[in-house]
Interface confidence: low
């Protein structure tokens, strides 16, 4: 059989008649920042070029001994995960090598500048089809570096990095930090988080996914046709940098925020053993494993959203969170989380000219998140309603008044500290599903969005019982764009939404009141693209979709014949 | 020995070519900060990347990169441009001791220096 | 102000190797690249390739690939196209044209007056 | 190889008049990241080095009047000239820079 990780990798199959030659990826050209490679090897042998790049620093110790096969290992192993002929995600991508790596796996932050800036100024030179940049590095955090990656990213080009090899928080390495990066984190055969000696992978809200990076077999520097297994974060990142690949060479014409939405759409949810992590990293660790799409076509008509944790707000009284958007995407939703439940909710407010979410802590609390729902929806047009505290014991209400303009998410936020047992109304009034209900002493804050054919419903799970968890999810076909809790009593911890559910969390049912005081709804919006289905219909009805997994196909066949020795 | 009279020699210019005055001040009230690595490890103290502010052009950069040149030569220390950033950031990169960061911080254009860090394969 | 200036005409036997010069002044030299366009009598331009005069690397049009050379002399800001086994074929003006590193294309907004370039025998 | 086709090869025109040049190239020189077609238009003299007009198939090159304008995408493009000069009888040349470089075959701008 195949090895674990390309299995891991490729979808089930998808129709039987969408047979593609191995040469995924094709159309793209893929930059590779590491150490030295042996670019003879049979796996790479002309899909290389090695650049004339070399900014490295020099080796530690008096004792070291340069050995070429040592100073190629780490590259040409990756280099053969992206493209190799045999063991490679992207058999048909043409790959570039810059060396900024010694020959002991050691780089600076300066090197990877320069090196980062030579790619930008050869793009600039010789615009070429999509670009993608295998990071397959670490240090620590560092404003410049991920300055450069956000500029080149900017620039139209895909970055994809390591988490770290830490078993720590990403969010303190770079480039790994840097939101514009696709920052990948390493599971292993079962599933589980790597673990790399007494350390392992790197986890939480700076990660966007994770992918195969243990026991991975690739081309070794040993010998032109020795084969090796090697693990890390680097490996994972090799395996997105070669479906990135092969997604940006099926539709070129992806974005970064298109590309990254889509890893996270065809990913495999929930499958990680959450335990391994940290218990205050586990609701921030996305819970995906990297796969190919089943097919190249049929993905245009999806309404993609993306859940986006900020950092923590601190525990100061008047702490905020922030959390935004990717400069493409839209902000359709805002709601926050506390360990605590001692939090002042949240809104949605413009900052630089496009919105972002802010969650507020409140006195005595440890500190806030907050969450934004951001979506790729063309063409649209948001705004935020907001209404005062009520007056009346009815609650505050809101709704999307405009003409054509649709509910997607409700947050509320108010400047008492305990906002107290009272308990609007959960049912809404007949006829009026576009408007979001709240406790009389909040503000409510209606996200309206017209976009050609969004349609959008409300969908609610109430519990009468004290839980700690209530959810609500929607169904094939619709996307999560708005998670709130009903009622916005302290006892609630806050709302998230992970995939296509929405979860609202509780305090321990110990330490909550009266069973009517545990009364907790989740309130879940679901939308969905006629126009964008439309537009998916039209061109599958005159493009014959090609799928991408059947690449590995031939493989398949063959493999057994190869590399059974695993080390 | 070369390289460093190579060096000499253009801090020699530069001292003859550049004002040291504050005709080029940073406007009132921005002040420019400075970052190093948390991992005390992986410090490299004795290269620092200044970054420049966004819209600074490539001839700012290296007259901003002489200019800090000028006026260490004139506190008797000697420093060595590696790279002048243009492209993607605005900037350059400068092996110097840390003495100087009050004064490299106090530049025109300057919006933050970072002090050179190691980075691992992973 | 910015200038490309080219080194004198030129005449060659076919058979032989011409070396045209275009010296840059008024910019920094290493942070453009250098073009090579020549345009035969009465004809339109043609591509021949450029050189990236900081790390020396070219990239070379198809039919000038096995005839050309292009260099470049940092220290006095030179770029150099050479180009041999001349044919009468080969008689045009060539120019040097420097490539505008700023922004997103691959445009020569400055360029050299024209090196003239006789083959005959 | 990308091919350029300009049209007319030659055109004949009075002071005043407005002028249009198209230009084909064989495939599109839309660049899918930047939103920006690779496309730059040159207006040479007899005798003289070729001068930058239009860079992304619109864009005026600083100090270029503003009675030159370019348009298009793709694969079509056009330069027009709104109101002749007399100083603008020269030979036009569109160029690709998607793929390497390609000069179209020159359009040449008589008085009449």
């Known amino acids: 059989s195949i090895p674990w990780n390309l299995e891991r990798i490729t979808p089930p199959r998808y129709r039987a008649d969408e047979y593609q030659p191995p040469d995924g990826g094709s159309l793209v050209e893929v930059y590779l920042l590491d150490t030295s490679i042996q670019s003879d090897h049979r796996e790479i042998e002309g899909r290389v070029m090695v650049t004339d790049f070399e900014n490295v620093p020099e080796e530690d110790g008096t004792r070291f001994h340069r050995q070429a096969s040592k100073c190629d290992s780490h590259g040409t192993h990756l280099a053969g995960v992206v493209s190799g002929r045999d063991a490679g995600v992207a058999k048909g991508a043409s790959m570039r090598s810059l060396r900024v790596l010694n020959c002991q796996g050691k780089g600076t932050v300066s090197g990877t500048l320069i090196g980062l800036e030579f790619i930008r100024k050869s793009q600039l030179v010789q615009p070429v089809g999509p670009l993608v940049v295998l990071l397959p590095l670490a240090g620590g955090y560092s404003r410049v570096l991920n300055a450069a990656c956000q500029r080149l990213a900017r620039a139209g080009v895909v970055l994809v990095t390591a988490a770290g090899n830490f078993r720590d928080d990403a969010c303190l390495y770079s480039p790994a930090s840097a939101p514009e990066v696709i920052t990948v984190g390493a599971t292993n055969a079962q599933d589980q988080p790597v673990t790399l000696g007494t350390l392992g992978t790197n986890f939480g809200r700076c990660v966007d996914l994770f992918a195969p990076g243990e026991d991975i077999i690739g081309a070794s520097s040993d010998c032109s046709t020795c084969f090796v297994s090697q693990s890390g974060t680097s490996q994972a990142a090799a395996h997105v940098a070669g479906i990135a690949a092969m997604m940006l060479s099926a539709e070129p014409e992806l974005t970064l925020a298109e590309l990254r939405q889509r890893l996270i759409h065809f990913s495999a949810k929930d499958v990680i053993n959450e335990a391994w992590f940290p218990e205050d990293q586990r609701v921030l660790t996305p819970n995906l494993v990297a796969a190919l799409p089943p097919s190249t076509h049929g993905a245009g008509w999806q309404l993609f959203c993306r859940t986006v944790w900020s950092a923590h707000s601190g525990p100061t009284r008047m702490a905020t969170a922030v959390a935004r958007c990717a400069p493409d995407e839209e902000l359709l939703s805002c709601s926050s989380f506390s360990r605590s439940g001692k939090r002042r909710g949240e809104r949605m407010e413009a900052q630089g000219g496009k919105l972002v979410c802010r969650a507020h802590n409140a006195f005595g609390g440890e500190g806030v998140y907050a969450i934004a729902r951001c979506c790729l929806l063309p063409q649209a047009n948001c705004s935020v309603h907001t209404a005062p505290p009520a007056e009346a014991s009815m609650g505050t209400r809101v709704h999307c008044h405009q003409q054509g303009h649709v509910l997607t998410g409700c947050s509320s936020h108010w400047e008492v500290e305990d906002l107290g047992t009272h308990k609007p109304p959960v049912l809404r009034p007949r006829g009026q599903p576009n408007q979001c209900v709240g406790h009389r002493e909040a503000s409510i804050h209606a996200s309206c969005c017209h976009a050609p054919g969004l349609e959008c419903k409300v969908k609610e799970h109430g519990i009468p019982a004290p839980q700690e968890q209530v959810t609500v999810a929607c169904e094939e076909g619709w996307t999560l764009t708005g998670c709130s809790a009903l009622p916005g009593t302290s006892h609630v911890l806050g709302a998230y939404a992970v995939d296509n559910t929405c979860v609202v969390r509780s305090r321990d049912v110990s330490t909550t009141g009266s069973t009517s005081e545990g009364a907790v709804t989740a309130v879940a919006i679901c939308c969905r693209s006629r126009h964008l289905a439309q537009a998916s219909q039209e061109l599958q009805g005159s493009t014959s979709g090609s799928g991408l997994n059947d690449i590995f196909e031939a493989q398949k066949i063959e493999w057994h014949e190869h590399h059974h020795h695993h080390h | 020995q070369e390289d460093e009279d190579g060096d000499y020699e253009e801090l020699v210019l530069a001292l003859r070519s550049e004002e040291d005055g504050l005709a080029e001040a940073p406007e009132h009230g921005t002040t420019a900060t400075f970052h190093r690595c948390a991992k005390d490890p992986w410090r490299l103290p004795g290269t620092y990347v200044v970054v420049l502010k966004e819209e600074t052009h490539l001839s700012q950069s290296e007259r901003t990169a002489r200019r800090l040149q000028a006026q260490a030569a004139r506190r008797g220390y000697l420093t060595k441009i590696l790279h002048v950033f243009h492209g993607l950031l605005p900037g350059f990169l400068v092996k110097m001791s840390g003495d100087l960061l009050e004064l490299a911080l106090k530049l025109p254009h300057v919006d933050y220096i970072e002090e050179d860090s190691s980075v691992f394969a992973q | 102000q910015v200038q490309l200036v080219q080194s004198g005409a030129e005449v060659k036997k076919p058979g032989a190797s011409v070396k045209v010069s275009c010296k840059a002044s008024g910019y920094t030299f290493n942070d453009y690249w250098m073009h090579w366009v020549r345009q035969a009598p009465g004809q339109g331009l043609e591509w021949m390739g450029y050189i990236n005069p900081s790390s020396g690397f070219t990239k070379y049009h198809q039919n000038f690939k096995d005839r050309v050379t292009m260099t470049a002399d940092k220290s006095i800001s030179t770029a150099y196209m050479e180009l041999s086994r001349l044919t009468s074929d080969d008689t045009a003006v060539y120019y040097c044209?420097?490539?505008?590193?700023?922004?997103?294309?691959?445009?020569?907004?400055?360029w050299g007056q024209g090196t003239t370039v006789t083959v005959s025998s | 190889d990308i091919q350029m086709s300009q049209s007319p090869s030659s055109l004949s025109a009075s002071v005043g008049d407005r002028v249009t040049i198209t230009c084909k190239s064989s495939q599109s020189l839309l660049n899918s990241r930047t939103r920006k077609n690779f496309l730059a238009w040159y207006q040479q003299k007899p005798g003289k080095a070729p001068k930058l007009l239009i860079y992304?198939?619109?864009t005026r090159e600083s100090g270029v009047p503003d009675r030159f304008s370019g348009s298009g995408s793709g694969t079509d493009f056009t330069l027009t000239i709104s109101s002749l000069q007399p100083e603008d009888f020269a030979t036009y040349y569109c160029?690709?820079?998607?793929?390497?470089?390609?000069f179209g075959q020159g359009t040449k701008l008589e008085i009449k």
């Open positions: 160029k690709q820079s998607f793929n390497l470089f390609t």
């Open positions: 044209a420097r490539q505008y590193d700023y922004d997103e294309d691959w445009y020569f907004d400055v």
């Open positions: 992304w198939a619109s």
